[in-house]
C-alpha cells in the first residue's frame, strides 16, 4: 500500500481543516489508515483523524483543530496498521479556504432595487471576520448566457443592483462566495443558490 | 465560554492531604491539556504540574515531584490534584489552568489551600 | 530550568502615559520556526491571572491594542502605549519553551 498523491490541506481558520490524498489503489480508508496531527507546541498531543472515502483511491479526513492563530503547525503522520506511509506539515494559516457565506436572501420589496444579503461565515471575534470580501453570481435560469459577477470589495455583506440591469418578467438565481486577501486564501465553495422573480415597472417613455 | 471551576481547598495540617478539583466546561476537555499553578500569599505565580489530553502524560515542577500528583477524568471533564505530605509552605491558591499552544489560555478563579496546626 | 527575570519590580505609572516592563531569560526562547516562546499575563487585583500576550508579540482575544509584547531571544518587552485605570495589576511573563514552565517574579503596575 502506497501514497500516490500526497496529502493536500486546507482550513477554514476556524475549527476544521480537510485533508486529501489518492492511494495507489483502492481502499477502504477507514478501516486501513489514519491521519495523526499535532500541534508543534509544548504540551500538544496528537490526535486521531479516521478517514472517509472520496473516490475508489481517494480520501478525505476533516481535522478538528483549534480557533487558528497564524503561529500554528502541525505535523502530520499517515499510518497503515503499524506502517508509517507518510509523514509531512502544515501550516493552517498558509492554506486557507473560507467557509460559504450563508442565508443569502433576495430582498425585491425596495423600489425598483434588488438588495442581496448574506451572512458572514465568522463569528466577530474571527480574525476573518473583518477581512473578506465577496462575489456575487447572477445567472438566468432561461439563458445560460446571461451569466454575471458582481464583485464585493467592501465589508458589509450585501449588494444592491438596479432591478433593471436585469430582465424584467423571468427568474433568476443567485449564489455568494468568499475570499481573504490578507492570506491570500483561495475562494470558498458557492454558498446554496437562491432564486427570485424579477419583475420592475418599465419607466414611461418620454416624447 | 470556557470556564474553570476549582474546588477542594480548605485547612489541612501539616502532613495531611487534599485532593482538589477543576471542573471544565465550554470546550472539548479531551483534546486540551491541562495545568495547575499555584500562587502563595503576596507572592507571586509558581507553576506546579501539566497532564496531556489523554492522561497519559504528566509533568511536575522538581518540587512537587513525589507529595503532587495530577489526573483527569475525561469521562467527568474534570482535571484533579492529589496533595501529600502537605507543609506549611504549600499555603497558597491553586488555580487550574488550560493549556494551548504552551500557554495558560484560561484560568479557573482559584482555590485556597491552608496548611496549618 | 529556565530563569526568567523581570524588572522593574514596582512600576508606578500615570494615567495616559506609556508604561514598559522587561522580562529576560537564562537561555533562548526562540525556537525553530521563529516564534518565541514567551507569554504576559496580568493579574488584577482580587483576580485570577489572564493571558495578554502569546508567543512573544501576539495579543490574545480581547486584549486591547494598547497592549504590545516585543523582542526576542532572551530580552523581551511589555509595553503599554497609554496606562488606563484598569491596566493596574501585578504583571508576569512566562516561557513556555520546556518544561517546568517558569514566571518572571511580577511587575507590580500602580498608579501614582
Known amino acids: 500500500m502506497k501514497v500516490l498523491q500526497e496529502p493536500t490541506c486546507v482550513s477554514d481558520y476556524m475549527s476544521i481543516s480537510t485533508c486529501e490524498w489518492k492511494m495507489n489503489g483502492p481502499t477502504n480508508c477507514s478501516t486501513e489508515l489514519r491521519l495523526l496531527y499535532q500541534l508543534v507546541f509544548l504540551l500538544s498531543e496528537a490526535h486521531t483523524c479516521i478517514p472517509e472515502n472520496n473516490g475508489g483511491a481517494g480520501c478525505v479526513c476533516h481535522l478538528l483543530m483549534d480557533d487558528v492563530v497564524s503561529a500554528d503547525n502541525y505535523t502530520l503522520d499517515l499510518w497503515a496498521g503499524q506502517q508509517l506511509l507518510w509523514k509531512g506539515s502544515f501550516k493552517p494559516s498558509e492554506h486557507v479556504k473560507p467557509r460559504a457565506p450563508g442565508n443569502l436572501t433576495v430582498h425585491t420589496n425596495v423600489s425598483d432595487t434588488l438588495l442581496l444579503t448574506w451572512s458572514n461565515p465568522y463569528p466577530p471575534d474571527n480574525y476573518l471576520y473583518n477581512h473578506l470580501t465577496y462575489a456575487v453570481n447572477i445567472w438566468s435560469e432561461n439563458d445560460p448566457a446571461d451569466f454575471r459577477i458582481y464583485n464585493v470589495t467592501y465589508l458589509e455583506p450585501s449588494l444592491r443592483i438596479a432591478a433593471s440591469t436585469l430582465k424584467s418578467g423571468i427568474s433568476y438565481r443567485a449564489r455568494v462566495r468568499a475570499w481573504a486577501q490578507c492570506y491570500n486564501t483561495t475562494w470558498s465553495e458557492w454558498s446554496p443558490s437562491t432564486k427570485w422573480h424579477n419583475s420592475y415597472r418599465e419607466p414611461f417613455e418620454q416624447h | 465560554e470556557v470556564q474553570l471551576v476549582e474546588s477542594g481547598g480548605g485547612l489541612v495540617q501539616p502532613g495531611g492531604s487534599l485532593r482538589l478539583s477543576c471542573a471544565a466546561s465550554g470546550f472539548t476537555f479531551s483534546r486540551y491539556a491541562m495545568s495547575w499553578v499555584r500562587q502563595a500569599p503576596g507572592k507571586g505565580l509558581e507553576w506546579v504540574s501539566a497532564i496531556g489530553g489523554s492522561g497519559g502524560s504528566t509533568y511536575y515542577a522538581d518540587s512537587f515531584k513525589g507529595r503532587f500528583t495530577i489526573s483527569r477524568d475525561n469521562s467527568k471533564n474534570t482535571l484533579y490534584l492529589q496533595l501529600n505530605s502537605l507543609r506549611a509552605e504549600d499555603t497558597a491558591v491553586y488555580y487550574c489552568?488550560?493549556?494551548?499552544?504552551?500557554?495558560?489560555?484560561?484560568w479557573g478563579q482559584g482555590t485556597l489551600v491552608t496548611v496549618s496546626s | 530550568d529556565i530563569v526568567m527575570t523581570q524588572s522593574p519590580l514596582s512600576l508606578p505609572v500615570t494615567p495616559g502615559e506609556p508604561a514598559s516592563i522587561s522580562c529576560k531569560s537564562s537561555q533562548s526562547l526562540l525556537e525553530g520556526q521563529g516564534y518565541n516562546r514567551l507569554d504576559w499575563y496580568l493579574q488584577k487585583p482580587g483576580q485570577s491571572p489572564q493571558l495578554l500576550i502569546y508567543?512573544?508579540?501576539n495579543r490574545a482575544s480581547g486584549v486591547p491594542d494598547r497592549f504590545s509584547g516585543s523582542g526576542s531571544g532572551t530580552d523581551f518587552t511589555l509595553k503599554i502605549s497609554r496606562v488606563e485605570a484598569e491596566d493596574v495589576g501585578i504583571y508576569y511573563c512566562?516561557?513556555?519553551?520546556?518544561?517546568?514552565?517558569?514566571f518572571g517574579g511580577g511587575t507590580k503596575v500602580e498608579i501614582k
Open positions: 489552568a488550560r493549556l494551548l499552544r504552551g500557554g495558560l489560555w484560561d
Open positions: 508567543l512573544g508579540s
Open positions: 512566562m516561557q513556555t519553551l520546556q518544561t517546568p514552565l517558569t
